[in-house]
């Protein structure tokens, strides 16, 4: 480091800034000698407000250093980012955002949950960091499957729904009326035939939520960003793989009237056996042959798959047959069914273990005269499509 040039003046001894040290320390510093400043952990080199990764000053011929010594300032992670559908509390002290400060993220209770503990610390790299080392914000995921509707297990007929009974119910308005089920705050599950032809003409799809009355003027509006129809669905050639997903342009805010339905757990098959009762809601045709003004629901039992397939062999539906990707529900004597206008809606079941409702079926097809004797409603079997659903949502 020493270069002796007697014609030049020595530079003044450098003084280490608070929370920093100088290296090398020399008795004198002459022309071309240099020193560097290093900060303690949790402190950073700042020249005013400009951050520096390193600092070295060189002694000049006139006996001055070529740059002033920066400060070692305590790392400041800055105000933490806002958490969508949540909030942040300062644990260390009000507005304290410096090195080793702790903050706690929480989700809006009742309607959102967080998988992590939400605790973040301001670390030496200047980023808020979780106990798992994550620098990204935690996520407030919508709670799913909460409902004020209680299933008595007995068929109680088509009845008007009450607020909060079917908060996942989505009204799809296009050339025809159809339905869907919210499964995330920005994804709707529906029947492929209900949105067929809408992949390009998406602007014609009007999506409404948080309503009971079909013609209500007060609703939460959503618009589609993308429509995904199952690649195995062929329009006009039966209803196999009659399933689709709609990605919403914006996330909807979850509340007691707008909430996703849960997707089935692996154990769901045991809750959807023959004679187990599910519930379906919709604004489709009623006994009078008109679209329902108010959201209606009916509790209906699952029908033995073979029995259903045989029934539709006896009285065929043009171009359709019951496949392994379908489940049937209804009464042998008829009278309780979903109908045109209900398509895409969810057939839901209560998971007794979690006390949450989940979607087991999607209203797909059935006899032209809805609710006819041995003319069961046919639903897309959602458990067969969990990988498909997850793949689309995760890769969007």
């Amino acid at each position: 480091h020493h270069h002796h040039h007697h014609a030049s003046q020595p530079c003044p001894d450098p003084t280490a800034p608070p929370n920093g040290h100088i290296s090398p320390v020399q008795a004198t510093y002459v022309l071309k000698d240099s020193f560097s400043v290093f900060c303690k952990t949790g402190f950073e080199l700042l020249q005013g407000s400009v951050p520096l990764k390193s600092f070295t000053a060189v002694c000049q011929k006139d006996g001055s250093w070529d740059r002033p010594i920066p400060e070692c300032s305590i790392i400041d992670c800055g105000p933490p980012d806002d958490l969508p559908n949540g909030h942040v509390d300062y644990i260390t002290g009000p507005e304290v955002t410096t090195y080793k400060a702790v903050i706690q993220y929480s989700c809006e209770e009742t309607f959102y949950t967080m998988s992590s503990n939400g605790k973040y610390v301001c670390e030496a790299d200047g980023f808020w960091t979780s106990s798992k080392g994550e620098k990204s914000l935690p996520v407030c995921k919508p709670v799913c499957g909460l409902s004020t509707h209680t299933s008595g297990g007995r068929i109680i007929g088509g009845q008007p729904a009450k607020p909060g009974d079917f908060p996942w119910q989505v009204l799809l308005l296009g050339e025809t009326t159809a339905a869907g089920a919210l499964i995330h705050d920005d994804w709707v599950l529906t029947a492929a035939h209900a949105v067929y032809g809408k992949t390009e003409a998406m602007s014609s799809l009007d999506i409404r939520m948080g309503i009971l009355k079909r013609l209500s003027l007060i609703y939460t509006q959503a618009w589609p960003e993308a429509v995904f129809i199952h690649e195995g669905y062929t329009h006009g050639a039966g209803f196999d793989n009659d399933i689709a997903l709609i990605k919403l342009k914006n996330k909807v805010t979850i509340n007691r009237n707008i909430m996703p339905i849960c997707l089935p757990r692996k154990e769901a098959a045991s809750l959807m056996k023959t004679d187990f009762v599910g519930t379906v809601a919709g604004w489709g045709l009623t006994q009078k042959g008109f679209l329902a003004r108010n959201l209606m629901f009916v509790d209906i039992p699952i029908v033995d798959h073979q029995k259903c397939a045989t029934a539709y062999t006896k009285q065929p539906y043009p171009g359709a047959k019951v496949t392994v990707n379908m489940l049937c529900a209804g009464l042998d004597r008829g009278g309780k069914d979903s109908c045109r206008g209900d398509a895409g809606g969810a057939l839901v079941f209560l998971d007794n273990e979690t006390q949450r409702w989940f979607v087991g079926g999607i209203v797909s097809w059935g006899s032209i005269n809805c609710g006819g004797s041995e003319q069961y409603g046919v639903y897309t079997k959602v458990t067969n499509y969990i990988p498909w659903i997850e793949n689309i949502i995760n890769n969007f």
């Epitope: 020249q47 005013g48 400009v50 951050p51 520096l52 002033p68 800055g78 790299d125 200047g126």
Partner: antibody, heavy 118, light 105 residues
Framework: DVQLQESGPGLVKPSQSLSLTCTVT?????????WNWIRQFPGNKLEWMGY???????SYNPSLKSRISITRDTSKNQFFLQLNSVTTEDTATYYC???????????WGQGTSVTVSS | IVMTQSQKFMSTSVGDRVSVTCKAS??????VAWYQQKPGQSPKALIY???YRYSGVPDRFTGSGSGTDFTLTISNVQSEDLAEYFC????????FGSGTKLELK
């Protein structure tokens, strides 16, 4: 030698987002310093918009904080400006610049003119 | 922090000595830089930390001041020095002065 080059659309519609890219050659943006966006309005007034530091931390002009985002792609040695909800008041020449507070030479791009108009 | 360059224009002659001033609305220590900008060009850095000259900058350019009052002095003005000069504080965030245009008398 360090060089900075701005790129992006010259015309943006009101209420839309303005997105610009700064490509840096001759120096790694993760090596040191602060990598800034600065704009110059007609009439020559200069405004510092914000920076992304070598470590990836950002600092923004408080007057723009609600609608600005500066990000980077270290693999391409680029950093980016996104300014949301633009109005005609955002019409300016946008510069990217390396500022080191004297610790290493300042370098500026040549600037890119952006007009906000319907 | 507001940086005020009270003189929008300054008239000078080749060979003159001229001082461009800049006043900060609060203490900025010595965290001030000076820039020169010619029409159609990007700003060019002249001075950092109030008084340190960037390498390659002619020694006729001198910066001084600390706290709130800062001066850029050009001794022996050359025709190529006719340009607009901006101060910049980088003590708290970054703010530029409004500029002073140096023109011939």
């Amino acid at each position: 030698d360090v060089q900075l080059q701005e790129s992006g659309p010259g015309l943006v519609k009101p209420s839309q987002s303005l997105s610009l890219t700064c490509t840096v050659t001759g120096y790694s943006i993760t090596s040191d310093y602060a990598w800034n966006w600065i704009r110059q309005f007609p009439g020559n007034k200069l405004e510092w918009m914000g920076y992304i530091s070598y470590s990836g931390r950002t600092s923004y002009n408080p007057s723009l904080k609600s609608r600005i985002s500066i990000t980077r792609d270290t693999s391409k040695n680029q950093f980016f400006l996104q300014l949301n909800s633009v109005t005609t008041e955002d019409t300016a020449t946008y510069y990217c610049a390396k500022l080191g507070g004297g610790h290493g030479m300042d370098y500026w791009g040549q600037g890119t003119s952006v007009t906000v108009s319907s | 922090i507001v940086m005020t360059q009270s003189q929008k224009f300054m008239s000078t002659s080749v060979g003159d000595r001229v001082s461009v001033t800049c006043k900060a609305s609060q203490n900025v220590d010595t965290n001030v830089a000076w820039y020169q900008q010619k029409p159609g060009q990007s700003p060019k850095a002249l001075i950092y930390s109030a008084s340190y000259r960037y390498s390659g900058v002619p020694d006729r350019f001198t910066g001084s001041g600390s706290g709130t009052d800062f001066t850029l002095t050009i001794s022996n003005v050359q025709s190529e020095d006719l340009a607009e000069y901006f101060c910049l504080q980088y003590n708290s965030y970054l703010t530029f002065g409004s500029g002073t245009k140096l023109e011939l008398k």
